[in-house]
Amino acid sequence: SEVEYRAEVGQNAYLPCFYTPAAPGNLVPVCWGKGACPVFECGNVVLRTDERDVNYWTSRYWLNGDFRKGDVSLTIENVTLADSGIYCCRIQIPGIMNDEKFNLKLVIKPAKVTPAPTRQRDFTAAFPRMLTTRGHGPAETQTLGSLPDINLTQISTLANELRDSRLANDLRDSGATIRIG
């Protein structure tokens, strides 16, 4: 059965997936797809990495962590109800039938109605992702996400809040992790 994760409409969703590279920089291809993991690949692929880089992605999907260290957790920007469903993270370990696959269920809840807008506390939205594609991805450099009006003090505050809340550790603890090598 799938592990369940939740987000509200308009927020960024986070789907954790990790592996431990056998050696620094010794990366393994990874794909993310919408739909449960099939026997090969990732259903409808939304993002993928190769041994060096993110080489394909679609709008609103990115890797916010350090994928070169095995953090291949998926961020989905500005989710809608249509983003609900099962997602597949597949660690494509070379060899005979070595793939590791994880099904993660994303549940999107309607946004809470609040009298006044609250400050965006999602640290993942604070920085755009600048990626130049390789291989099969779009040819041009894309900026995924938007850069909010934010100053260095706010960035520092957000970083401290993230560290203090131990959110990163909590998310890592709840995610799928495998060790390679």
Epitope: V39, E41, N44, V45, I93, P94, G95, M97
Partner: antibody, heavy 122, light 107 residues
Framework: EVKLVESGGGLVQPGGSLRLSCAAS????????MAWVRQAPGKGLEWVAN????????YYLDSLKSRFTISRDNAKNSLYLQMNSLKAEDTAVYYC???????????????WGQGTLVTVSS | DIQMTQSPSSLSASVGDRVTITCRAS??????LAWYQQKPGKAPKLLIY???TLAEGVPSRFSGSGSGTDFTLTISSLQPEDFATYYC?????????FGQGTKLEIK
């Protein structure tokens, strides 16, 4: 036009070896997983093996993985099946088939070769 | 292994008939199901993939439905060229497995 052409079949004695080849054309070979599927005379279809885009990952029917090896040469647009220690029950038509592509989505063997007959008999 | 069970094993029908073939998976395969048509001495031909998507060049009288464990292939109005053997196949679990086939014969 997508074309898959198998070769290398024939009559072989039990315990012998054969290497099947599949020449692909009409599509970007390195963008697709490829497969071998076999069909014994008068029987149904049985999956044999799959290989990913660059050959780094392979997948087999458990009962065959110690004797069969799937491989590919993207520079030659070719798929191979090395079959060792052949048994009478390996007698079948062997088909090469194109499987899922780089972006996923289409899960089915969209194109098949005409097949090559392997007969294992003394 | 995921077992695929087709029914019926054989079926007699006439040109113009509506025909339904079912396929049941022993485990949830979501929508990772394909249907093939095979004529004697020929390679199989993909009809439907992802349970309900018509493959390129396949006439619209063919349709697929279902998800999870129960799937159906329907031919809305049989044509003479449709008499053949039909197979379902799952792409969810390893090993990939096929149904045993349904032979569609002329009544």
């Amino acid at each position: 036009e997508v074309k898959l052409v198998e070769s290398g079949g024939g009559l072989v004695q039990p315990g012998g070896s054969l290497r099947l080849s599949c020449a692909a054309s009409g599509f970007t070979f390195s963008d697709y997983y490829m497969a071998w599927v076999r069909q014994a005379p008068g029987k149904g279809l049985e999956w044999v093996a799959n290989i990913n885009y660059d050959g780094s990952s392979t997948y087999y029917l458990d009962s065959l993985k110690s004797r069969f090896t799937i491989s590919r040469d993207n520079a030659k647009n070719s798929l191979y099946l090395q079959m060792n220690s052949l048994k009478a029950e390996d007698t079948a038509v062997y088909y090469c088939a194109r499987d899922v592509g780089y972006y996923g989505g289409n899960y089915g063997f969209a194109y098949w070769g005409q097949g090559t007959l392997v007969t294992v008999s003394s | 292994d995921i077992q695929m069970t087709q029914s019926p094993s054989s079926l007699s029908a006439s040109v113009g008939d509506r025909v339904t073939i079912t396929c049941r998976a022993s485990d949830n395969i979501y929508s990772y199901l394909a249907w093939y048509q095979q004529k004697p001495g020929k390679a199989p031909k993909l009809l439907i993939y992802n349970a309900k998507t018509l493959a390129e060049g396949v006439p619209s009288r063919f349709s697929g439905s279902g998800s999870g464990t129960d799937f159906t292939l329907t031919i809305s109005s049989l044509q003479p060229e449709d008499f053949a053997t039909y197979y379902c196949q799952q792409h969810y679990g390893s090993p990939l497995t096929f149904g045993q086939g349904t032979k569609l014969e002329i009544k």
